[in-house]
Protein backbone atom coordinates (compact mmCIF):
# COMPACT_ATOMS: atom_id res chain seq x y z
CA UNK A 1 0.00 0.00 0.00
CA UNK A 2 1.34 3.38 -1.03
CA UNK A 3 1.59 6.03 1.71
CA UNK A 4 1.17 9.72 0.96
CA UNK A 5 1.63 12.49 3.55
CA UNK A 6 -0.36 15.67 3.31
CA UNK A 7 -0.43 19.05 5.08
CA UNK A 8 -3.57 20.49 6.64
CA UNK A 9 -4.93 23.24 4.40
CA UNK A 10 -2.89 22.13 1.40
CA UNK A 11 -3.89 20.24 -1.75
CA UNK A 12 -2.85 16.64 -2.38
CA UNK A 13 -2.90 14.65 -5.60
CA UNK A 14 -3.29 10.87 -5.30
CA UNK A 15 -2.26 9.10 -8.50
CA UNK A 16 -3.97 6.21 -10.25
CA UNK A 17 -2.63 4.85 -13.54
CA UNK A 18 -4.19 2.40 -15.99
CA UNK A 19 -2.12 0.21 -18.30
CA UNK A 20 -4.06 1.56 -21.30
CA UNK A 21 -3.08 5.07 -22.27
CA UNK A 22 -6.66 6.15 -22.94
CA UNK A 23 -9.72 7.39 -21.12
CA UNK A 24 -11.53 4.53 -19.51
CA UNK A 25 -13.94 4.23 -16.62
CA UNK A 26 -12.52 4.74 -13.13
CA UNK A 27 -13.73 5.69 -9.70
CA UNK A 28 -12.23 6.61 -6.34
CA UNK A 29 -13.71 5.32 -3.09
CA UNK A 30 -12.80 5.71 0.56
CA UNK A 31 -12.24 2.85 3.02
CA UNK A 32 -15.98 2.72 3.71
CA UNK A 33 -16.55 2.03 0.01
CA UNK A 34 -18.27 5.37 -0.44
CA UNK A 35 -17.73 6.73 -3.92
CA UNK A 36 -15.83 10.02 -4.02
CA UNK A 37 -15.60 10.63 -7.74
CA UNK A 38 -15.34 8.90 -11.09
CA UNK A 39 -16.19 9.44 -14.71
CA UNK A 40 -18.94 8.85 -17.18
CA UNK A 41 -17.36 9.15 -20.58
CA UNK A 42 -15.70 12.55 -20.51
CA UNK A 43 -17.78 13.82 -17.58
CA UNK A 44 -16.64 13.96 -13.95
CA UNK A 45 -19.14 12.50 -11.52
CA UNK A 46 -19.11 12.87 -7.76
CA UNK A 47 -20.40 10.57 -5.05
CA UNK A 48 -21.96 11.30 -1.64
CA UNK A 49 -18.70 11.52 0.32
CA UNK A 50 -17.73 14.32 2.72
CA UNK A 51 -15.10 15.38 0.19
CA UNK A 52 -17.73 16.28 -2.38
CA UNK A 53 -16.92 19.98 -2.68
CA UNK A 54 -13.17 19.53 -2.18
CA UNK A 55 -12.51 16.58 -4.50
CA UNK A 56 -11.51 16.94 -8.13
CA UNK A 57 -9.56 15.20 -10.87
CA UNK A 58 -7.49 16.28 -13.86
CA UNK A 59 -9.50 15.56 -17.01
CA UNK A 60 -6.60 16.51 -19.24
CA UNK A 61 -4.69 13.44 -17.99
CA UNK A 62 -7.47 10.86 -18.53
CA UNK A 63 -6.49 10.32 -22.17
CA UNK A 64 -3.01 9.28 -20.97
CA UNK A 65 -4.50 6.70 -18.60
CA UNK A 66 -3.95 8.86 -15.48
CA UNK A 67 -6.91 9.35 -13.12
CA UNK A 68 -5.73 11.40 -10.14
CA UNK A 69 -7.81 12.28 -7.07
CA UNK A 70 -7.17 15.84 -6.03
CA UNK A 71 -8.25 16.85 -2.51
CA UNK A 72 -8.15 20.56 -1.70
CA UNK A 73 -7.96 22.27 1.70
CA UNK A 74 -6.91 19.09 3.46
CA UNK A 75 -8.26 18.27 6.90
CA UNK A 76 -6.82 15.86 9.47
CA UNK A 77 -9.99 13.77 9.17
CA UNK A 78 -9.27 13.28 5.45
CA UNK A 79 -6.65 10.77 6.58
CA UNK A 80 -7.91 7.47 5.16
CA UNK A 81 -7.19 4.71 2.69
CA UNK A 82 -8.38 5.75 -0.78
CA UNK A 83 -9.10 3.11 -3.41
CA UNK A 84 -8.90 3.70 -7.14
CA UNK A 85 -10.83 1.15 -9.19
CA UNK A 86 -9.80 0.99 -12.84
CA UNK A 87 -9.56 -1.92 -15.37
CA UNK A 88 -10.81 -4.40 -12.79
CA UNK A 89 -7.91 -3.58 -10.54
CA UNK A 90 -7.73 -1.70 -7.25
CA UNK A 91 -4.96 0.71 -6.25
CA UNK A 92 -4.85 1.60 -2.55
CA UNK A 93 -3.29 4.81 -1.28
CA UNK A 94 -3.04 5.65 2.41
CA UNK A 95 -3.28 9.38 3.00
CA UNK A 96 -2.05 10.76 6.31
CA UNK A 97 -2.74 14.46 6.92
CA UNK A 98 -0.74 16.41 9.49
CA UNK A 99 -1.03 19.93 10.81
CA UNK A 100 1.54 21.97 12.69
CA UNK A 101 0.51 25.14 14.47
CA UNK A 102 2.06 27.65 16.84
CA UNK A 103 0.46 27.69 20.31
CA UNK A 104 -1.16 31.10 20.06
CA UNK A 105 0.15 33.89 17.96
CA UNK A 106 3.20 33.74 15.73
CA UNK A 107 4.17 37.18 17.08
CA UNK A 108 5.78 36.52 20.45
CA UNK A 109 7.60 38.72 22.94
CA UNK A 110 11.28 38.14 23.58
CA UNK A 111 11.65 35.76 26.51
CA UNK A 112 8.30 34.10 25.93
CA UNK A 113 7.86 30.44 24.98
CA UNK A 114 6.98 29.04 21.58
CA UNK A 115 4.98 25.81 21.54
CA UNK A 116 4.42 24.00 18.27
CA UNK A 117 1.61 21.44 18.29
CA UNK A 118 1.34 18.62 15.80
CA UNK A 119 -2.13 17.48 14.77
CA UNK A 120 -2.01 13.93 13.49
CA UNK A 121 -4.49 11.24 12.50
CA UNK A 122 -5.37 8.48 14.99
CA UNK A 123 -3.06 5.49 14.83
CA UNK A 124 -0.10 7.45 13.45
CA UNK A 125 3.15 7.80 15.39
CA UNK A 126 5.05 10.62 13.75
CA UNK A 127 8.28 12.22 14.90
CA UNK A 128 8.93 15.94 14.45
CA UNK A 129 12.16 17.85 14.08
CA UNK A 130 12.28 21.64 13.81
CA UNK A 131 15.14 23.88 12.84
CA UNK A 132 15.12 27.47 14.07
CA UNK A 133 16.39 30.38 11.94
CA UNK A 134 19.62 30.33 13.94
CA UNK A 135 20.15 26.64 13.16
CA UNK A 136 19.08 25.18 16.50
CA UNK A 137 17.40 21.76 16.20
CA UNK A 138 14.60 20.62 18.49
CA UNK A 139 12.86 17.28 18.43
CA UNK A 140 9.65 15.97 19.90
CA UNK A 141 6.37 14.16 19.52
CA UNK A 142 2.99 15.88 19.57
CA UNK A 143 4.35 19.12 21.03
CA UNK A 144 7.64 20.94 20.81
CA UNK A 145 8.51 23.77 23.16
CA UNK A 146 11.17 26.44 23.03
CA UNK A 147 11.42 28.58 26.14
CA UNK A 148 13.03 32.01 26.38
CA UNK A 149 12.75 33.05 22.74
CA UNK A 150 15.56 35.28 21.55
CA UNK A 151 15.72 37.86 18.82
CA UNK A 152 17.64 35.42 16.58
CA UNK A 153 14.64 33.07 16.72
CA UNK A 154 12.73 35.46 14.46
CA UNK A 155 12.20 34.10 10.96
CA UNK A 156 11.15 30.87 9.30
CA UNK A 157 11.10 27.72 11.36
CA UNK A 158 11.36 24.58 9.21
CA UNK A 159 9.75 21.50 10.70
CA UNK A 160 9.89 18.00 9.25
CA UNK A 161 7.28 15.40 10.16
CA UNK A 162 8.42 11.80 9.62
CA UNK A 163 5.98 8.90 9.29
CA UNK A 164 6.44 5.52 7.53
CA UNK A 165 9.81 6.70 6.14
CA UNK A 166 7.97 9.51 4.38
CA UNK A 167 8.32 13.13 5.35
CA UNK A 168 6.40 16.34 5.03
CA UNK A 169 7.84 19.79 5.65
CA UNK A 170 6.17 22.72 7.38
CA UNK A 171 7.37 26.29 7.39
CA UNK A 172 6.20 28.60 10.16
CA UNK A 173 7.10 32.28 10.26
CA UNK A 174 7.77 33.45 13.79
CA UNK A 175 8.23 37.11 14.72
CA UNK A 176 10.01 37.77 18.01
CA UNK A 177 8.95 41.17 19.28
CA UNK A 178 11.98 42.86 20.83
CA UNK A 179 14.17 45.92 20.83
CA UNK A 180 17.21 45.65 18.57
CA UNK A 181 19.52 45.93 21.56
CA UNK A 182 18.90 44.56 25.03
CA UNK A 183 21.18 47.20 26.50
CA UNK A 184 23.03 50.32 25.45
CA UNK A 185 25.37 52.79 27.09
CA UNK A 186 25.80 56.49 26.35
CA UNK A 187 28.94 58.40 27.39
CA UNK A 188 28.62 62.18 27.68
CA UNK A 189 30.49 65.19 29.01
CA UNK A 190 28.62 67.28 31.54
CA UNK A 191 26.31 69.73 29.80
CA UNK A 192 26.08 67.87 26.50
CA UNK A 193 22.73 66.90 25.03
CA UNK A 194 21.94 63.20 25.39
CA UNK A 195 20.12 61.14 22.75
CA UNK A 196 18.60 57.79 23.65
CA UNK A 197 17.26 55.60 20.84
CA UNK A 198 15.18 52.46 21.21
CA UNK A 199 14.85 50.87 17.75
CA UNK A 200 12.52 47.89 17.45
CA UNK A 201 13.73 44.69 15.79
CA UNK A 202 10.46 44.05 13.96
CA UNK A 203 8.02 45.79 11.68
CA UNK A 204 4.28 45.44 11.85
CA UNK A 205 1.51 47.24 10.01
CA UNK A 206 -0.05 48.80 13.09
CA UNK A 207 1.75 49.17 16.36
CA UNK A 208 -0.24 50.22 19.41
CA UNK A 209 0.69 50.16 23.07
CA UNK A 210 2.09 52.18 25.93
CA UNK A 211 5.52 52.63 27.46
CA UNK A 212 7.46 54.06 30.34
CA UNK A 213 11.06 54.91 31.15
CA UNK A 214 12.11 54.21 34.74
CA UNK A 215 15.41 55.68 35.83
CA UNK A 216 17.73 54.72 38.67
CA UNK A 217 20.21 57.56 39.07
CA UNK A 218 23.45 56.56 40.76
CA UNK A 219 22.97 59.36 43.27
CA UNK A 220 19.30 58.62 43.98
CA UNK A 221 17.85 56.41 46.68
CA UNK A 222 14.89 55.32 44.52
CA UNK A 223 14.10 54.78 40.88
CA UNK A 224 11.85 57.35 39.24
CA UNK A 225 9.46 57.36 36.35
CA UNK A 226 10.89 59.81 33.83
CA UNK A 227 8.30 59.58 31.08
CA UNK A 228 5.16 57.68 30.10
CA UNK A 229 3.83 57.59 26.56
CA UNK A 230 1.29 56.01 24.24
CA UNK A 231 1.89 54.46 20.85
CA UNK A 232 -0.98 54.50 18.35
CA UNK A 233 -0.35 53.22 14.84
CA UNK A 234 3.34 54.06 15.18
CA UNK A 235 2.58 57.61 16.40
CA UNK A 236 4.07 58.51 19.79
CA UNK A 237 2.30 60.79 22.24
CA UNK A 238 3.69 61.71 25.65
CA UNK A 239 1.32 61.18 28.58
CA UNK A 240 3.47 62.48 31.42
CA UNK A 241 7.02 63.66 31.84
CA UNK A 242 8.95 64.36 35.02
CA UNK A 243 9.72 67.97 36.01
CA UNK A 244 13.42 67.23 36.25
CA UNK A 245 14.88 66.29 33.83
CA UNK A 246 12.66 67.73 31.12
CA UNK A 247 12.84 64.90 28.59
CA UNK A 248 11.67 65.31 25.02
CA UNK A 249 10.35 62.47 22.91
CA UNK A 250 10.14 62.03 19.16
CA UNK A 251 6.67 61.67 17.66
CA UNK A 252 7.58 58.81 15.30
CA UNK A 253 9.29 55.44 15.54
CA UNK A 254 11.99 54.51 16.40
CA UNK A 255 11.35 55.60 19.99
CA UNK A 256 13.70 58.49 20.64
CA UNK A 257 14.33 60.47 23.82
CA UNK A 258 16.39 63.61 24.31
CA UNK A 259 17.83 64.75 27.63
CA UNK A 260 18.65 68.48 27.28
CA UNK A 261 21.93 68.12 29.18
CA UNK A 262 23.98 65.42 30.82
CA UNK A 263 24.42 66.16 34.52
CA UNK A 264 26.03 64.06 37.26
CA UNK A 265 22.67 63.70 39.04
CA UNK A 266 21.20 62.00 35.94
CA UNK A 267 23.99 59.44 35.52
CA UNK A 268 22.68 55.95 36.07
CA UNK A 269 20.64 53.32 34.33
CA UNK A 270 17.14 53.22 32.96
CA UNK A 271 14.67 50.62 31.79
CA UNK A 272 12.33 51.41 28.95
CA UNK A 273 9.31 49.12 28.89
CA UNK A 274 6.80 48.83 26.09
CA UNK A 275 3.48 47.03 26.52
CA UNK A 276 1.93 46.13 23.18
CA UNK A 277 -1.81 45.91 22.65
CA UNK A 278 -3.19 42.35 22.79
CA UNK A 279 0.09 40.99 24.14
CA UNK A 280 0.82 39.80 27.63
CA UNK A 281 4.19 40.87 28.94
CA UNK A 282 6.42 43.79 28.01
CA UNK A 283 9.43 44.58 25.88
CA UNK A 284 12.44 45.89 27.77
CA UNK A 285 15.56 47.82 26.87
CA UNK A 286 18.15 48.91 29.38
CA UNK A 287 19.95 52.18 28.81
CA UNK A 288 22.90 53.55 30.76
CA UNK A 289 24.30 57.05 31.04
CA UNK A 290 27.86 57.86 32.07
CA UNK A 291 28.68 61.53 32.69
CA UNK A 292 32.16 63.09 32.89
CA UNK A 293 33.17 66.33 34.55
CA UNK A 294 36.60 67.98 34.57
CA UNK A 295 37.10 70.88 37.01
CA UNK A 296 39.88 72.98 38.47
CA UNK A 297 39.48 74.27 42.01
CA UNK A 298 42.40 76.25 43.38
CA UNK A 299 45.45 74.02 42.88
CA UNK A 300 43.50 70.82 42.22
CA UNK A 301 42.58 69.56 38.75
CA UNK A 302 39.93 66.85 39.05
CA UNK A 303 38.21 64.53 36.64
CA UNK A 304 35.18 62.52 37.71
CA UNK A 305 32.76 60.12 36.08
CA UNK A 306 29.33 59.10 37.33
CA UNK A 307 27.18 56.24 36.21
CA UNK A 308 27.55 52.51 35.55
CA UNK A 309 31.18 52.02 34.55
CA UNK A 310 32.86 48.63 34.43
CA UNK A 311 35.80 48.09 36.83
CA UNK A 312 38.19 47.62 33.90
CA UNK A 313 37.64 51.16 32.58
CA UNK A 314 40.58 53.51 33.01
CA UNK A 315 40.28 57.18 33.93
CA UNK A 316 43.29 59.35 33.07
CA UNK A 317 44.42 62.96 33.23
CA UNK A 318 47.08 64.05 30.79
CA UNK A 319 48.55 67.21 29.41
CA UNK A 320 47.97 67.35 25.65
CA UNK A 321 50.58 65.37 23.67
CA UNK A 322 52.20 64.07 26.85
CA UNK A 323 52.06 60.88 28.87
CA UNK A 324 49.21 60.48 31.32
CA UNK A 325 50.03 62.16 34.62
CA UNK A 326 47.57 59.96 36.48
CA UNK A 327 45.71 56.86 35.36
CA UNK A 328 43.46 54.77 37.60
CA UNK A 329 40.65 52.23 37.50
CA UNK A 330 38.59 54.59 39.62
CA UNK A 331 35.77 57.08 39.15
CA UNK A 332 37.81 60.14 40.12
CA UNK A 333 41.40 61.20 39.44
CA UNK A 334 43.19 64.46 40.23
CA UNK A 335 46.45 66.32 39.79
CA UNK A 336 47.72 68.82 42.36
CA UNK A 337 49.37 71.99 41.07
CA UNK A 338 48.79 71.18 37.38
CA UNK A 339 51.07 72.92 34.93
CA UNK A 340 49.54 75.35 32.44
CA UNK A 341 48.19 73.96 29.17
CA UNK A 342 45.33 71.97 27.72
CA UNK A 343 44.56 68.97 29.92
CA UNK A 344 42.59 65.98 28.76
CA UNK A 345 40.49 63.72 30.91
CA UNK A 346 40.02 60.36 29.21
CA UNK A 347 37.79 57.42 30.02
CA UNK A 348 39.04 54.43 28.10
CA UNK A 349 38.48 50.72 27.69
CA UNK A 350 41.56 48.71 26.63
CA UNK A 351 43.06 51.78 24.98
CA UNK A 352 39.85 52.80 23.19
CA UNK A 353 38.68 56.26 24.30
CA UNK A 354 34.99 56.26 25.27
CA UNK A 355 34.76 59.79 26.63
CA UNK A 356 37.02 62.81 26.61
CA UNK A 357 36.80 66.20 28.29
CA UNK A 358 39.31 69.02 27.84
CA UNK A 359 40.09 71.75 30.35
CA UNK A 360 42.52 74.60 29.90
CA UNK A 361 44.73 75.34 32.88
CA UNK A 362 46.03 78.90 32.78
CA UNK A 363 49.16 80.12 34.53
CA UNK A 364 48.52 80.47 38.28
CA UNK A 365 47.54 84.13 38.24
CA UNK A 366 44.45 83.52 36.07
CA UNK A 367 41.31 81.33 36.22
CA UNK A 368 40.75 78.14 34.19
CA UNK A 369 38.85 78.07 30.91
CA UNK A 370 36.59 75.20 29.91
CA UNK A 371 36.44 74.91 26.12
Amino acid sequence: KKVVLGKKGDTVELTCTASQKKSIQFHWKNSNQIKILGNQGSFLTKGPSKLNDRADSRRSLWDQGNFPLIIKNLKIEDSDTYICEVEDQKEEVQLLVFGLTANSDTHLLQGQSLTLTLESPPGSSPSVQCRSPRGKNIQGGKTLSVSQLELQDSGTWTCTVLQNQKKVEFKIDIVVLAFQKASSIVYKKEGEQVEFSFPLAFTVEKLTGSGELWWQAERASSSKSWITFDLKNKEVSVKRVTQDPKLQMGKKLPLHLTLPQALPQYAGSGNLTLALEAKTGKLHQEVNLVVMRATQLQKNLTCEVWGPTSPKLMLSLKLENKEAKVSKREKAVWVLNPEAGMWQCLLSDSGQVLLESNIKVLPTWSTPVQP
Epitope: Q216, S221, S222, S223, K224, S225, R240, T242, Q243, D244
Partner: antibody, heavy 119, light 107 residues
Framework: QVQLVESGGGVVQPGRSLRLSCTAS????????IHWVRQAPGKGLEWVTI????????YYADSVKGRFAISRDNSKNTLYLQMNSLRAEDTAVYYC????????????WGQGTLVTVSS | AIQMTQSPSSLSASVGDRVTITCRAS??????LGWYQQKPGKAPNLLIY???NLQSGVPSRFSGSGSGTDFTLTISSLQPEDFATYYC?????????FGQGTKVEIK
Protein backbone atom coordinates in the same frame (compact mmCIF):
# COMPACT_ATOMS: atom_id res chain seq x y z
CA GLN B 1 -2.25 50.52 46.07
CA VAL B 2 0.88 51.60 47.95
CA GLN B 3 0.77 50.64 51.63
CA LEU B 4 3.29 51.05 54.43
CA VAL B 5 2.56 49.55 57.83
CA GLU B 6 4.79 50.24 60.84
CA SER B 7 4.96 47.91 63.84
CA GLY B 8 7.11 47.22 66.89
CA GLY B 9 6.42 50.36 68.91
CA GLY B 10 5.83 50.28 72.63
CA VAL B 11 7.12 51.39 76.01
CA VAL B 12 10.81 50.88 76.67
CA GLN B 13 13.18 51.97 79.43
CA PRO B 14 15.98 54.48 78.76
CA GLY B 15 19.18 52.78 77.59
CA ARG B 16 17.29 49.78 76.20
CA SER B 17 16.73 48.76 72.58
CA LEU B 18 13.74 48.39 70.30
CA ARG B 19 13.32 47.31 66.69
CA LEU B 20 10.66 48.82 64.45
CA SER B 21 9.45 47.24 61.23
CA CYS B 22 7.79 48.74 58.18
CA THR B 23 6.08 46.29 55.85
CA ALA B 24 5.47 47.47 52.29
CA SER B 25 2.94 46.31 49.71
CA UNK B 26 1.42 47.52 46.45
CA UNK B 27 4.71 48.47 44.82
CA UNK B 28 8.06 47.01 43.81
CA UNK B 29 9.86 47.50 47.14
CA UNK B 30 13.29 46.69 45.67
CA UNK B 31 13.23 49.89 43.57
CA UNK B 32 12.72 52.37 46.38
CA UNK B 33 14.70 54.01 49.11
CA ILE B 34 12.66 54.30 52.33
CA HIS B 35 12.81 56.99 55.02
CA TRP B 36 11.99 57.04 58.72
CA VAL B 37 10.51 60.28 60.07
CA ARG B 38 9.45 60.84 63.68
CA GLN B 39 7.27 63.24 65.61
CA ALA B 40 7.52 63.79 69.35
CA PRO B 41 4.16 64.39 71.09
CA GLY B 42 2.95 67.91 70.33
CA LYS B 43 6.14 68.70 68.38
CA GLY B 44 7.14 69.02 64.72
CA LEU B 45 8.36 66.45 62.21
CA GLU B 46 11.99 65.26 62.39
CA TRP B 47 13.66 63.34 59.58
CA VAL B 48 15.54 60.36 61.04
CA THR B 49 17.16 58.17 58.39
CA ILE B 50 17.06 56.72 54.86
CA UNK B 51 18.24 53.52 53.25
CA UNK B 52 18.93 53.18 49.51
CA UNK B 53 16.85 50.83 47.34
CA UNK B 54 19.64 48.22 47.42
CA UNK B 55 20.82 48.92 50.97
CA UNK B 56 24.12 50.32 49.65
CA UNK B 57 23.81 53.74 51.35
CA UNK B 58 22.36 54.94 54.65
CA TYR B 59 22.12 58.43 56.11
CA TYR B 60 21.13 59.49 59.62
CA ALA B 61 20.11 62.65 61.47
CA ASP B 62 22.83 63.81 63.87
CA SER B 63 20.51 63.19 66.83
CA VAL B 64 20.42 59.41 66.20
CA LYS B 65 23.79 58.76 64.56
CA GLY B 66 25.65 55.90 66.22
CA ARG B 67 22.55 54.71 68.09
CA PHE B 68 20.05 53.88 65.36
CA ALA B 69 20.61 51.49 62.44
CA ILE B 70 18.38 51.22 59.38
CA SER B 71 18.24 47.99 57.36
CA ARG B 72 15.99 46.23 54.89
CA ASP B 73 15.09 42.75 53.70
CA ASN B 74 14.00 43.05 50.08
CA SER B 75 12.87 39.42 49.99
CA LYS B 76 10.34 40.22 52.75
CA ASN B 77 9.43 43.74 51.55
CA THR B 78 10.35 44.95 55.02
CA LEU B 79 12.30 47.88 56.42
CA TYR B 80 13.76 47.90 59.93
CA LEU B 81 14.90 50.52 62.40
CA GLN B 82 17.08 49.16 65.19
CA MET B 83 17.06 51.70 68.03
CA ASN B 84 19.72 51.27 70.70
CA SER B 85 20.62 53.34 73.80
CA LEU B 86 17.18 54.88 73.77
CA ARG B 87 16.61 58.25 75.44
CA ALA B 88 13.51 60.04 76.68
CA GLU B 89 13.83 62.46 73.74
CA ASP B 90 13.40 59.52 71.31
CA THR B 91 9.77 59.27 72.43
CA ALA B 92 7.75 59.88 69.27
CA VAL B 93 5.46 58.46 66.61
CA TYR B 94 7.74 56.86 64.01
CA TYR B 95 6.62 56.91 60.38
CA CYS B 96 8.16 55.15 57.39
CA UNK B 97 7.74 57.01 54.12
CA UNK B 98 8.41 56.47 50.43
CA UNK B 99 9.15 58.99 47.71
CA UNK B 100 6.82 59.63 44.79
CA UNK B 101 7.46 57.87 41.46
CA UNK B 102 7.89 61.21 39.71
CA UNK B 103 9.64 63.45 42.25
CA UNK B 104 11.60 63.45 45.50
CA UNK B 105 8.66 64.33 47.73
CA UNK B 106 7.57 61.89 50.44
CA UNK B 107 4.24 60.95 48.90
CA UNK B 108 3.43 57.74 50.77
CA TRP B 109 3.42 57.37 54.56
CA GLY B 110 2.56 54.68 57.04
CA GLN B 111 0.10 55.29 59.88
CA GLY B 112 2.95 55.52 62.41
CA THR B 113 3.92 53.53 65.50
CA LEU B 114 4.37 55.11 68.94
CA VAL B 115 7.62 54.58 70.84
CA THR B 116 7.62 55.71 74.47
CA VAL B 117 10.96 55.83 76.32
CA SER B 118 10.23 56.04 80.03
CA SER B 119 11.42 54.55 83.27
CA ALA C 1 23.23 69.96 58.38
CA ILE C 2 21.08 72.50 56.54
CA GLN C 3 18.82 74.47 58.88
CA MET C 4 15.27 75.24 57.76
CA THR C 5 13.62 78.23 59.44
CA GLN C 6 9.86 78.44 59.00
CA SER C 7 7.71 81.41 59.82
CA PRO C 8 5.36 82.20 61.35
CA SER C 9 5.15 79.36 63.85
CA SER C 10 1.38 79.88 63.96
CA LEU C 11 -1.24 82.10 62.39
CA SER C 12 -4.96 82.73 62.70
CA ALA C 13 -7.00 83.21 59.57
CA SER C 14 -10.57 83.06 58.30
CA VAL C 15 -12.12 81.00 55.52
CA GLY C 16 -11.44 82.77 52.20
CA ASP C 17 -8.24 84.45 53.43
CA ARG C 18 -5.01 84.36 51.48
CA VAL C 19 -2.33 82.73 53.62
CA THR C 20 1.44 82.84 53.11
CA ILE C 21 4.03 80.72 54.92
CA THR C 22 7.77 81.13 54.38
CA CYS C 23 10.74 78.86 54.76
CA ARG C 24 14.39 79.91 54.71
CA ALA C 25 17.32 77.53 54.15
CA SER C 26 20.71 78.12 55.81
CA UNK C 27 22.37 77.51 52.42
CA UNK C 28 21.44 77.34 48.74
CA UNK C 29 19.20 74.33 48.10
CA UNK C 30 18.22 75.31 44.52
CA UNK C 31 14.55 74.23 44.24
CA UNK C 32 14.91 71.04 46.30
CA LEU C 33 12.06 71.72 48.69
CA GLY C 34 8.69 70.17 49.48
CA TRP C 35 5.70 71.40 51.46
CA TYR C 36 3.58 69.09 53.62
CA GLN C 37 0.24 69.39 55.40
CA GLN C 38 -0.47 67.48 58.61
CA LYS C 39 -3.73 67.15 60.48
CA PRO C 40 -3.85 65.94 64.12
CA GLY C 41 -3.34 62.19 64.50
CA LYS C 42 -2.62 61.75 60.79
CA ALA C 43 0.49 61.23 58.67
CA PRO C 44 1.73 64.23 56.66
CA ASN C 45 0.52 64.79 53.10
CA LEU C 46 2.73 66.07 50.25
CA LEU C 47 1.36 69.28 48.71
CA ILE C 48 4.21 70.79 46.70
CA TYR C 49 7.42 69.26 45.35
CA UNK C 50 10.47 70.89 43.77
CA UNK C 51 9.46 74.24 45.36
CA UNK C 52 6.65 75.08 42.95
CA ASN C 53 5.06 71.92 41.55
CA LEU C 54 1.63 70.86 42.72
CA GLN C 55 1.45 67.21 43.73
CA SER C 56 -1.18 65.18 41.89
CA GLY C 57 -4.60 65.38 43.60
CA VAL C 58 -3.81 68.56 45.57
CA PRO C 59 -6.24 71.51 45.09
CA SER C 60 -4.94 74.35 42.92
CA ARG C 61 -5.45 76.92 45.70
CA PHE C 62 -2.09 75.68 47.04
CA SER C 63 1.01 77.06 45.32
CA GLY C 64 4.69 77.23 46.01
CA SER C 65 7.44 79.57 44.90
CA GLY C 66 11.07 80.38 45.56
CA SER C 67 14.53 79.10 44.79
CA GLY C 68 17.92 79.14 46.48
CA THR C 69 17.26 79.97 50.13
CA ASP C 70 13.82 81.60 50.30
CA PHE C 71 10.59 79.74 49.71
CA THR C 72 6.88 80.44 50.09
CA LEU C 73 3.72 78.36 50.36
CA THR C 74 0.54 80.24 49.50
CA ILE C 75 -3.07 79.20 50.05
CA SER C 76 -5.04 81.56 47.81
CA SER C 77 -8.42 81.14 49.52
CA LEU C 78 -8.40 79.25 52.80
CA GLN C 79 -10.98 76.47 53.10
CA PRO C 80 -12.27 74.85 56.33
CA GLU C 81 -10.29 71.65 55.58
CA ASP C 82 -7.02 73.64 55.30
CA PHE C 83 -6.75 74.29 59.04
CA ALA C 84 -3.70 72.16 59.82
CA THR C 85 0.06 72.35 60.42
CA TYR C 86 2.35 72.93 57.43
CA TYR C 87 6.01 71.89 57.14
CA CYS C 88 8.74 72.49 54.60
CA UNK C 89 11.35 69.79 53.95
CA UNK C 90 14.63 70.24 52.09
CA UNK C 91 15.58 67.29 49.90
CA UNK C 92 18.82 68.78 48.60
CA UNK C 93 21.18 67.07 51.06
CA UNK C 94 21.38 64.43 53.76
CA UNK C 95 20.46 64.66 56.50
CA UNK C 96 17.08 65.91 55.29
CA UNK C 97 15.64 68.63 57.50
CA PHE C 98 12.13 69.92 58.19
CA GLY C 99 11.10 73.41 59.16
CA GLN C 100 9.61 73.76 62.65
CA GLY C 101 6.06 73.91 61.26
CA THR C 102 3.33 76.54 60.95
CA LYS C 103 -0.01 75.93 62.61
CA VAL C 104 -2.90 77.52 60.72
CA GLU C 105 -5.80 78.11 63.12
CA ILE C 106 -9.32 79.49 62.75
CA LYS C 107 -9.60 83.14 63.71
Amino acid sequence: QVQLVESGGGVVQPGRSLRLSCTASGFNFINYGIHWVRQAPGKGLEWVTIIWYDGSKKYYADSVKGRFAISRDNSKNTLYLQMNSLRAEDTAVYYCAREDDWNDGLAYWGQGTLVTVSS
Amino acid sequence: AIQMTQSPSSLSASVGDRVTITCRASQDIRNDLGWYQQKPGKAPNLLIYAASNLQSGVPSRFSGSGSGTDFTLTISSLQPEDFATYYCLQDSNYPRTFGQGTKVEIK
